[in-house]
């Protein structure tokens, strides 16, 4: 299975030697080291951590470790002019103010430079007005408000609960609805699991806890001032008015103690149904405005944050390949955190650190991977995936020619129930085969494989006896590699039981309470789940970098393409009359998928039979596998989203975190019944079917015999 080139370790021991070298105790030690102070992007503390990681990766044995810096737009609160929200009376007096910072966790009371909760990239402003409660501020929530309830958000301040979708989509939706400000809050229904105590006695969110986060709508652009190009020393920067993705209205996050004080006075319309009610003891009235006794009171926002061009630092480590040094397998995760980063990102960074150490140990014993492995510690992920995107923009020509795969390594855990994997279909078989070889860390699965516990706890909705593997969306550093450059990508982490825990993400996400102790006391005291994630991520990198034939199965792409074509066709068929009127046909797409399936099948047969000792033929076959993901890239990108260029997958236009299949067709069909010009709208559907069919056919042809 694995290459024996340039090594003094026998092939069957390569992967085992690598996996055996990974130690839970080391991950624990690294996590502790990375979480003692805040490492906010653009700060001296995060620069110092970058230099520390550079130094340690060199000690671990990598061939070279360099810092790559960029000057990008970041956002910070004003230290002397704090952000807050008030309830004001008819005289303009502030009768209630939201908190200025979170109560620090025990043991951290004297830590300096804890950034108070804020919505990064919010413009400055002091809007005042009536409040409207908009549930999760999803597209469908605004449809319900505007179309069914006839509630106008224009000129109002909206309050939305966190969860379900990326916060930037909430803000975009509020802007489009005409709101003049947005308040984001964490409802206990979404961030407080029943039967669990709040931190520091458990892993639930206390009432004073607040989720930080950026509210950009970058659509893959990277630094808002230099879209498409690296923010280097000679960069031409856009003016702030032309910057990509910045919100136009003030936004601020609060905890549920403060939300209670705002929501308890709400009047106006009752909530449309139970799905609009959270767990606070408030009526969840939609508004607008406060109820009778309080109707003269208004809400006022005080936002004074500033956007600043600031230097950020990626750490890039190289372990040169012995046989194919011009083929890159990349393992990357971010280093910057909102505060301590106990889970996000340092549970991931600690795993990357241990993977680097293990690879370095093998290298010191004389082993090298077949292909080059690049390790990355990205900066400014929390501010819009900026470090990874700028580096990929700077190195795009190398990456598009040499990039084999990208494995993401943000948070290793978001729970401790089972494995969660999102990846390209090309990696399905790799993930299946690897997890069959790894031991499950789960209670009740002693002596069983990870594949078995994962499949039992998270079964595939389509294929019995197989685990669920999800589509890649965005909201993390794989975005530029997969969605823009078309490099096969994957991610893995341990997750919660989605059946029983209906809250969004994990309760303490992006709060001050995301500490080392949170992980060590409540999530993974033995660090066995971290170790398993290290084995999965590291094992994937090892196989991708070391197997003679790339561990990609193109037949799995054929299967999902058929599934996605069926799905988008069934969405379109909700409009049978219009399809007939405007002669909308999916025949070209289904034909292309059929061709892809047949060609992929034949390619796989050839892959079994070819002479692997012929380096030219081996390289040719591997290049066809490597470039298959690339073949799904449309150089023109998706409509109004030029940096989302993958035709099969894109982040949902309604939720950046979620992946959408055939996104061009999906978006053309979305809410089509409300379009003012149906002929034009259905024309765009037809165009998108054409683009998808062409792309699938073109991708299929890259797998055909070359001559």
């Amino acid at each position: 299975k694995s290459s024996n080139e340039a090594t003094n370790i026998t092939p069957k021991h390569n992967m085992k030697a690598f996996l055996d070298e990974l130690k839970a105790e080391n991950i624990k030690k690294f996590l502790y080291n990375f979480t003692q102070i805040p490492h906010l992007a653009g700060t001296e503390q995060n620069f110092q951590l970058a230099k520390q990681i550079q130094s340690q990766w060199k000690e671990f044995g990598l061939d070279s470790v360099e810092l790559a810096h960029y000057d990008v737009l970041l956002s910070y609160p004003n230290k002397t002019h704090p952000n807050y929200i008030s309830i004001i009376n008819e005289d303009g007096n502030e009768i209630f103010n939201t908190s200025l910072f979170e109560p620090p966790p025990p043991g951290y009371e004297n830590v300096s430079d804890i950034v108070p909760p804020f919505s990064a990239f919010s413009p400055q402003g002091m809007p005042e007005g009536d409040l409207v409660y908009v549930n999760y501020a999803r597209t469908e929530d605004f449809f319900k408000l505007e179309r069914d309830m006839k509630i106008n958000c224009s000129g109002k301040i909206v309050i939305a609960r966190y969860g379900k979708v990326f916060r930037g989509n909430k803000v975009k939706n509020a802007q489009l609805a005409g709101a003049k400000g947005v308040i984001l809050y964490s409802d206990p229904a979404d961030y407080f699991a029943p039967g669990v105590k709040s931190y520091p006695d458990g892993w639930n969110l206390p009432g004073g806890g607040v989720q930080r986060g950026n509210i950009l709508n970058l659509n893959g652009a990277g630094d808002p001032l230099t879209p498409g190009y690296p923010a280097n020393e000679y960069a031409y920067r856009r003016g702030i008015a032309e910057a990509v993705g910045l919100p136009s209205i003030p936004v601020h996050p609060i905890g549920y103690y403060d939300a209670q004080k705002l929501l308890e006075k709400m009047g106006g319309s009752a909530p449309p149904d139970s799905s609009w009610r959270g767990s606070l003891k408030v009526p969840y009235n939609v508004g607008p405005g406060f109820t009778g006794n309080f109707s003269t009171q208004k809400v006022k926002m005080h936002i004074h944050s500033t956007n600043e061009v600031t230097r950020i630092y990626n750490v890039i480590g190289t372990l040169r390949g012995a046989v194919e040094p011009d083929r890159y397998v990349i393992l990357g995760g971010h280093r910057d955190s909102w505060v301590f980063g106990g889970i996000d990102p340092q549970s991931g960074a600690a795993v990357v650190h241990e993977i680097v150490r293990s690879f370095g140990t093998l290298k010191k014993e004389g082993w090298r991977p077949r292909r080059t492995i690049l390790f990355a510690s990205w900066d400014a992920e929390e501010f819009g995936l900026l470090g990874s995107t700028e580096w990929a923009e700077e190195n795009s020509r190398l990456l598009q020619e040499r990039g084999v795969a990208y494995i993401n390594a943000d948070s290793s855990i978001e729970g401790n129930y089972t494995l969660r994997v999102d990846c390209t279909p090309l990696m399905y078989s790799l993930v299946h085969n690897l997890t069959k070889e790894l031991k499950s860390p789960d209670e009740g699965f002693e002596g069983k494989s990870l594949y078995e516990s994962w499949t039992k706890k998270s079964p595939s909705p389509e294929f019995s006896g197989m685990p669920r593997i999800s589509k890649l969306g965005s909201g993390n550093d794989f975005e530029v590699f997969f969605q823009r450059l078309g490099i096969a990508s994957g991610r893995a982490r341990y997750t919660k039981n989605w059946e029983t825990n209906k809250f969004s993400g994990y309760p303490l996400y992006h709060s001050v309470y995301e500490t080392y102790e949170l992980v060590e006391k409540f999530y993974d005291p033995m660090f066995k789940y971290h170790l398993t994630v290290a084995q999965v991520r590291g094992g994937m990198v090892f196989e991708l970098a070391n197997s003679i034939v790339l561990p990609f199965d193109c037949r799995d792409y054929a299967v999902v393409l058929r599934k996605y074509a069926d799905k988008i066709y069934s969405i379109s068929m909700k409009h049978p009359q219009e399809m007939k009127t405007y002669s909308v046909s999916f025949d070209s797409l289904f034909s292309a998928v059929k061709n892809f399936t047949e060609i992929a099948s034949k390619f796989s047969e050839r892959l079994q039979d070819f002479d692997k000792s012929n380096p030219i033929v081996l390289r040719m076959m591997n290049d066809q596998l490597m470039f298959l993901e690339r073949a799904f890239i449309d150089p023109l990108g998706l409509p109004d989203r030029p940096f989302y260029r993958h035709v099969i997958y894109a982040p949902s236009s309604h939720n950046k975190y979620a992946g959408e299949s055939f996104p061009g067709i999906y978006d053309a069909l979305f809410d089509i019944e409300s379009k003012v010009d149906p002929s034009k709208a259905w024309g765009e559907v037809k165009r998108q079917i054409y683009v998808a069919a062409f792309t699938v056919q073109a991708a299929a042809e890259t797998l055909s015999e070359v001559a």
């Epitope: 103010n97 109560p103 009371e109």
Partner: nanobody, 123 residues
């Protein structure tokens, strides 16, 4: 040991000012809302003022509104009560009391008390 120690009380003439302090030890003042409570001779306890952990909100009993100011210095782990325009009816033992809920936005129940400091307003 968790404790609150009040100081600054004394005898003062009506219309004059006094500043009470409350030093906290054994727990982080920065995480808790704090209260001043008083007990006049022969009477029950009366709540006087509350300040949130971050100082963003202050609430006062109607009887002291506009005359008393509650403040805090989290770096010094100390709570203050500035009392101006004192009246004879302000005569009482003044206690500082810690709110039991971390991060509370309004006064809740108290779980730690000081021993009190006597304020006498008399001509």
């Amino acid at each position: 040991e968790v404790q609150l120690v009040e100081s600054g009380g004394g005898v003062v003439q009506p219309g004059r000012s006094l500043r009470l302090s409350c030093a906290a030890s054994g727990f982080p003042l920065i995480s808790y809302g704090m209260n001043w409570v008083r007990q006049a001779p022969g009477k029950g306890l009366d709540w006087v003022a509350f300040i949130t952990y971050d100082g963003s909100n202050r609430y006062y009993a109607d009887s002291v509104k506009g005359r008393f100011t509650i403040s805090r210095d989290n770096s010094k782990n100390t709570l203050y009560l500035q009392m101006n325009s004192l009246k004879p009816e302000d005569t009482a033992v003044y206690y500082c009391a810690k709110d039991r809920i971390v991060g509370a936005r309004v006064p809740d129940a108290y779980d730690i008390w000081g021993q009190g400091t006597m304020v006498t307003v008399s001509s």
